[in-house]
């Protein structure tokens, strides 16, 4: 099941997705799409990076973090109820069934009516930003920060693959952070 994130109408929504490049500048193509991840690529692409830069984006969708360091989290500006739904972050690691795909559910709530004008907090600031993997080897576990609306049972252990070796090529299709290299 998808990890759920929430935002109010008019706020910016933040959908986290990360990977760790094997070396600085050694980027992996990433696509973001509206709708669950299909078998290949992303459907209804809203943003895409290649091995150098962001090469496609649509209005209101942008990367706020440093994508050159693997922070490919999506920010959706000034959300409306129509922005609710599943979003796909696909980290397109080359190799047979080597890519990683993450489905994130965005729930948009109507804006709260407040009696007095107050400074509205940006949605992005409400979310801790990192979900990292630690260790090395097939029994690697994840270290979680405080992530709102995440049920821990939804996050399974990620195998830190010896990618491109003749060893384990076992992909765990969950969580939203991977290490490459």
């Amino acid at each position: 099941s998808e990890v759920e994130y929430r935002a109010e109408v008019g706020q910016n929504a933040y959908l986290p997705c990360f990977y760790t490049p094997a070396a600085p500048g050694n980027l992996v193509p990433v696509c973001w799409g509206k709708g669950a991840c299909p078998v290949f690529e992303c459907g209804n692409v809203v943003l895409r990076t290649d091995e150098r830069d962001v090469n496609y984006w649509t209005s209101r969708y942008w990367l706020n973090g440093d994508f050159r360091k693997g922070d490919v989290s999506l920010t959706i500006e000034n959300v409306t109820l129509a922005d609710s739904g599943i979003y796909c972050c696909r980290i397109q690691i080359p190799g047979i069934m080597n890519d990683e795909k993450f489905n994130l559910k965005l729930v948009i709530k109507p804006a709260k009516v407040t009696p007095a004008p107050t400074r509205q907090r940006d949605f992005t600031a409400a979310f801790p930003r990192m979900l990292t993997t630690r260790g090395h080897g097939p029994a690697e576990t994840q270290t979680l920060g405080s992530l709102p609306d995440i049920n821990l049972t939804q996050i399974s252990t990620l195998a830190n693959e010896l990618r491109d070796s003749r060893l384990a090529n076992d992909l765990r299709d969950s969580g939203a952070t991977i290490r490459i290299g």
Epitope: P21, A22, A23, N26, L27, V28, P29, V39, F40, E51, R52, Q92, I93, P94, G95, I96, M97, N98, D99, S156, E161, R163, D164, S165, R166, L167, A168, N169, D170, L171, R172, D173, I180, G181
Partner: antibody
Framework: EVQLVESGGGLVQPGGSLRLSCAAS????????MSWVRQVPGKGLEWISG????????DYVEPIEGRFTISRDNAKNTLYLQMNSLKSEDTAVYYC??????????WGQGTQVTVSS | DIVMTQSPSSVTASVGEKVTINCKSS????????????LNWYQQRPGQPPRLLIY???TQESGIPDRFSGSGSTTDFTLTISSVQPEDAAVYYC?????????FGSGTRLEIK
């Protein structure tokens, strides 16, 4: 020595079903993604499906998605392909292949599937 | 999808001759993260399953004779058989393993005179 032995092929009518099996030996089966590749007689090769080592991820090409199901039993070192709603264009030799991220490094001998009325 | 185009479709050679088979991908199959080309070569003898010869464009699979070598990068790749032997009569396929679907070339048939 790596060995992959497919079975379960045969003649089936359009709309029918078959279940292919691939018995693996000579390597740690659950460490590896496994794939099915098919070859229409006299034609080229087509990767059609793959399954990760723990079975947690499965991928299919569009022509078979929703009709074929790949699965594995790691306790039995066996890979499966359940083929439903078969069409004449599914007629081919079906190979299972041990899969590394960069290649299909070992292949079985193949099993013939013929879909005909 | 990445389309793989092989040439020639067939080639005839005498024992001891050098043979080159070409493969072109419709887009780059080089990984930015490890700088490797996700391009494979397979040999399929009559009545046999395919056998991996070369992966990463130029890395020879274990047990493959040294007369088989691969070269190239980005989108243009070559399989070279330095001195053809009778047992090399087969169809040779390239395949990209960069992104799904992992398409194969249409094959090059090698016949021995």
């Amino acid at each position: 020595e790596v060995q992959l032995v497919e079975s379960g092929g045969g003649l089936v009518q359009p709309g029918g079903s078959l279940r292919l099996s691939c018995a693996a030996s000579g390597f740690t089966f659950d460490d590896y993604t496994m794939s099915w590749v098919r070859q229409v007689p006299g034609k080229g090769l087509e990767w059609i499906s793959g399954i990760s080592g723990n079975g947690g991820r499965t991928d299919y090409v569009e022509p078979i998605e929703g009709r074929f199901t790949i699965s594995r039993d790691n306790a039995k070192n066996t890979l499966y392909l359940q083929m439903n709603s078969l069409k004449s264009e599914d007629t081919a030799v079906y190979y299972c292949a041990k899969t590394s991220p960069q290649s299909l490094d070992y292949w079985g001998q193949g099993t013939q599937v013929t879909v005909s009325s | 999808d990445i389309v793989m185009t092989q040439s020639p479709s067939s080639v005839t050679a005498s024992v001891g001759e050098k043979v080159t088979i070409n493969c072109k991908s419709s887009q780059s199959v080089v990984s930015g993260s490890n700088q490797k080309s996700y391009l494979n070569w397979y040999q399929q003898r009559p009545g046999q399953p395919p056998r991996l010869l070369i992966y990463y464009a130029s890395t020879q699979e274990s047990g493959i004779p040294d007369r088989f070598s691969g070269s190239g990068s980005t989108t243009d790749f070559t399989l070279t058989i330095s001195s053809v032997q009778p047992e090399d009569a087969a169809v040779y396929y390239c395949q990209q393993a960069y992104s799904a679907p992992y398409n194969f070339g249409s094959g090059t048939r090698l016949e021995i005179k």
